[in-house]
Interface confidence: medium
């Protein structure tokens, strides 16, 4: 069976004009998943991203996340790239006062 992930992108303010953007994938199966931040379509280097492990979410499916810190005002340059069971998609950082974007694919 294949259950595609729900993707949720959030922003949280941090100091000195930087923000942390977090991309969460949840409710997916099987466990193997690609999750990374891209800037202008290019994957960020590994040491600029932080990942959570892929863990059970209690419903027979899995969840994980990736986060990175970016300059405030540059949100439109960043997307979260997801690949799972042959499907893939990119999810933008929400702009303005909207702090979350959720999509099912």
């Amino acid at each position: 069976r294949t259950v595609p992930p729900m993707v949720n992108v959030t922003c949280s303010e941090v100091s000195e004009g930087n923000i942390t953007v977090t991309c969460r994938a949840s409710s997916f199966y099987p466990r193997n998943i690609t999750l990374t931040w891209r800037q202008d379509g290019v994957s960020l280097s590994h040491n600029t991203q932080q990942w959570g492990d892929v863990l059970p979410d209690g419903n027979g499916t899995y969840q994980t996340w990736v986060a990175t810190r970016i300059r405030q005002g540059e949100e439109q340059r960043f997307t979260c790239y997801m690949e799972h069971s042959g499907n893939h998609g990119t999810h933008p950082v929400p702009s303005g006062k909207v702090l979350a974007l959720q999509s099912q694919w």
Epitope: T36, S43, W51, D53, P56, V66, Y81, G86
Partner: antibody, heavy 119, light 108 residues
Framework: QVQLKQSGPGLVQPSQSLSITCIVS????????VHWVRQSPGKGLEWLGM???????DYNAAFISRLSINKDNSKSQVFLKMNSLQADDTGIYYC?????????????WGQGTSVTVSS | QILLTQSPAILSASLGERVTMTCTAS???????LHWYQQKPGSSPKLWIY???NLASGVPARFSGGGSGTSYSLTVSNMEAEDAATYYC?????????FGSGTKLEIK
């Protein structure tokens, strides 16, 4: 820095079991998973199985009946036990850290435990 | 399981030469999950290239990787003595995760 140090016997009798301990430092087993891989002249590199941060395990179907992987987070130790060893189980056994994120590559390897199965 | 076939088994190259080795998968592998490791005699393998084309930390820029689907390659643009080693491809696309049999790169 990240290190995986292995200990275990070099010689195992046929039909007996193999136990190897992998002690990790520089990272936490609550943050990273660990693979076990072996290397032999006849079969090359073979993935045996892995343990995730939450303690769940995935095994290569070819070994699932005689392999178990466990860990002790507080002691930063991962354990491999393989039963019913035969001559073709001779090889070097590695514990390997599972890289994070979008690539899941095996990013740090232990020094290996050389195992000979012989009477 | 996915079989990875590496060729050639042994690759002899002169210093300064450009060399390419290949890894062919028996079924399609996502480029995100195709990795390369370098191993020298008496040492453990080291992560060398991850996700087809990304160099691991400390790997010289003369190395590059490419490919998609069932066909992948590792290239050394300017062979140096320290590059002599065995290189293994590896797929994390589908369990059981598998490795190629290796290409031994040696100095001619």
């Amino acid at each position: 820095q990240v290190q995986l140090k292995q200990s275990g016997p070099g010689l195992v009798q046929p039909s007996q079991s193999l136990s190897i301990t992998c002690i990790v430092s520089g990272f936490s087993l609550t943050t990273y998973g660990v693979h076990w891989v072996r290397q032999s002249p006849g079969k090359g590199l073979e993935w045996l199985g892995m343990i995730w941060t939450d303690g769940t395990t995935d095994y290569n179907a070819a070994f699932i009946s005689r392999l178990s992987i466990n860990k002790d987070n507080s002691k930063s130790q991962v354990f491999l036990k393989m039963n019913s060893l035969q001559a073709d189980d001779t090889g070097i056994y590695y514990c390997v850290r599972k890289g994070h994120g979008y690539y899941y590559a095996m990013d740090y390897w232990g020094q290996g435990t050389s195992v000979t199965v012989s009477s | 399981q996915i079989l990875l076939t590496q060729s050639p088994a042994i690759l002899s190259a002169s210093l300064g030469e450009r060399v390419t080795m290949t890894c062919t998968a028996s079924s399609s592998v996502s480029s995100s999950y195709l990795h390369w490791y370098q191993q020298k005699p008496g040492s453990s393998p080291k992560l060398w290239i991850y996700s087809t084309s990304n160099l691991a930390s400390g790997v010289p820029a003369r190395f590059s990787g490419g490919g998609s689907g069932t066909s992948y390659s590792l290239t050394v643009s300017n062979m140096e003595a320290e590059d002599a080693a065995t290189y293994y491809c590896h797929q994390y696309h589908r369990s059981p995760f598998t490795f190629g049999s290796g290409t031994k790169l040696e100095i001619k």
